[in-house]
């Protein structure tokens, strides 16, 4: 059974990726964003379920998508560089998986532009969050 | 990490037919197009045709239409490329390489040589 | 079909040069360009996507500009590692082409 301070974690790091992610969509919805219309082209795959953390094998698949359509923005709409960016909620998504168990993702068949994937993922962080609080 | 890893080269007699596969690991399969291109000794590369591993569609480089088939194995993560109706400038190595909308092709093969000799 | 042109087909450069490389696609392809690098014996490698977002891994030497029909690949300061054959790709629409290749010698 989960222990109080892994539950703390747990819910410390899903805000930690939340936070991130919202800084994602902030960045390139920022107005000074000019390739804003090139970046809403790209389809993203979203999860058929996403109900608990293992379904964040999802999240972590389309990651290396993500980091190369945020290279198209000017690097001065984000704090940190798209590839720092990815590389750390790549660790926090890591941890909060586990990589013990092997899930295999299963994707929607109706793919989604960069904003509704990040706020589908926001959506996710704050359902966990508010299951753990 | 992702890999693309292809069958081993080949020696086909003209007129026969040659499947070269692909094996992906690392992500999910169908998430990402299939590409084929060919490479003739010295030359340049020459697309060949695409599959998306998800929904099966292909599509080929009119110069191999009637000649090639794309197809997959999504429970084994492979995809296949048969070229039928061999000749001597058939001679080339093949390559695989994944793409996705305008990423390009971020992951290539390591290519296998088929020669066409009689 | 788009035909890419790529010049010059072959270019004699040293270490230290800058060197450009050009890309000439027959009808407008937006921003839908890639360069890749390949040496003998091994598969391309891709260097730039979209005409100039370089993916993490590349050398930040590289650099890739234009948009429409006329895109350039531009290596700021070449390294010994850098002599290898240099090819376009348009993937704004079927059938996909690449250029007829750039090959970078050691003058």
């Known amino acids: 059974a989960p222990t109080s301070s892994s539950t703390k974690k747990t819910q410390l790091q899903l805000e930690h990726l939340l936070l991130d992610l919202q800084m994602i969509l902030n960045g390139i919805n920022n107005y000074k964003n000019p390739k804003l219309t090139r970046m809403l082209t790209f389809k993203f795959y979203m999860p058929k379920k996403a109900t608990e953390l293992k379904h964040l094998q999802c999240l972590e698949e389309e990651l290396k998508p993500l980091e190369e359509v945020l290279n198209l923005a000017q690097s001065k709409n984000f704090h940190l560089r798209p590839r720092d960016l990815i590389s750390n909620i790549n660790v926090i998504v890591l941890e909060l998986k586990g990589s013990e168990t092997t899930f295999m993702c299963e994707y929607a068949d109706e793919t989604a532009t960069i904003v509704e994937f990040l706020n589908r993922w926001i959506t996710f962080c704050q359902s966990i969050i508010s299951t753990l609080t | 990490q992702v890999q693309l890893v292809q069958s081993g080269a080949e020696v086909k007699k003209p007129g026969a037919s040659v499947k070269v596969s692909c094996k992906a690991s690392?992500?999910?399969?169908?998430?990402?197009?299939i590409n084929w291109v060919r490479q003739a000794t010295g030359q340049g590369l020459e697309w060949m045709g695409w599959m998306n591993p998800n929904s099966g569609n292909t599509g080929y480089a009119q110069k191999f239409q009637g000649r090639v088939t794309m197809t997959r194995n999504t429970s084994i993560s492979t995809a296949y490329m048969e070229l039928s109706s061999l000749r001597s400038e058939d001679t080339a190595v093949y390559y695989c390489?994944?793409?996705?909308?305008?990423?390009?092709?971020?992951?290539w093969g390591q290519g296998t040589l088929v020669t066409v000799s009689s | 079909d788009i035909q890419m042109t790529q010049s010059p087909s072959s270019l004699s450069a040293s270490v230290g040069d800058r060197v450009t490389i050009t890309c000439r696609a027959s009808q407008g392809i937006g921003d839908d360009l890639g360069w890749y690098q390949q040496k003998p014996g091994k598969a391309p490698q891709r260097l730039i996507y979209s005409a100039s977002s370089l993916p993490s891994g590349v050398p930040s030497r590289f650099s890739g500009s234009g948009s429409g029909t006329e895109f350039t690949l531009t290596i700021s300061s070449l390294q010994p590692e850098d002599f290898a054959t240099y090819y376009c790709l348009q993937h704004n629409s079927y059938p996909r082409s690449f250029g007829q290749g750039t090959k970078l010698e050691i003058r």
């Open positions: 690392g992500y999910t399969f169908t998430t990402y197009d």
């Open positions: 390489a994944r793409g996705r909308q305008w990423l390009g092709f971020d992951y």
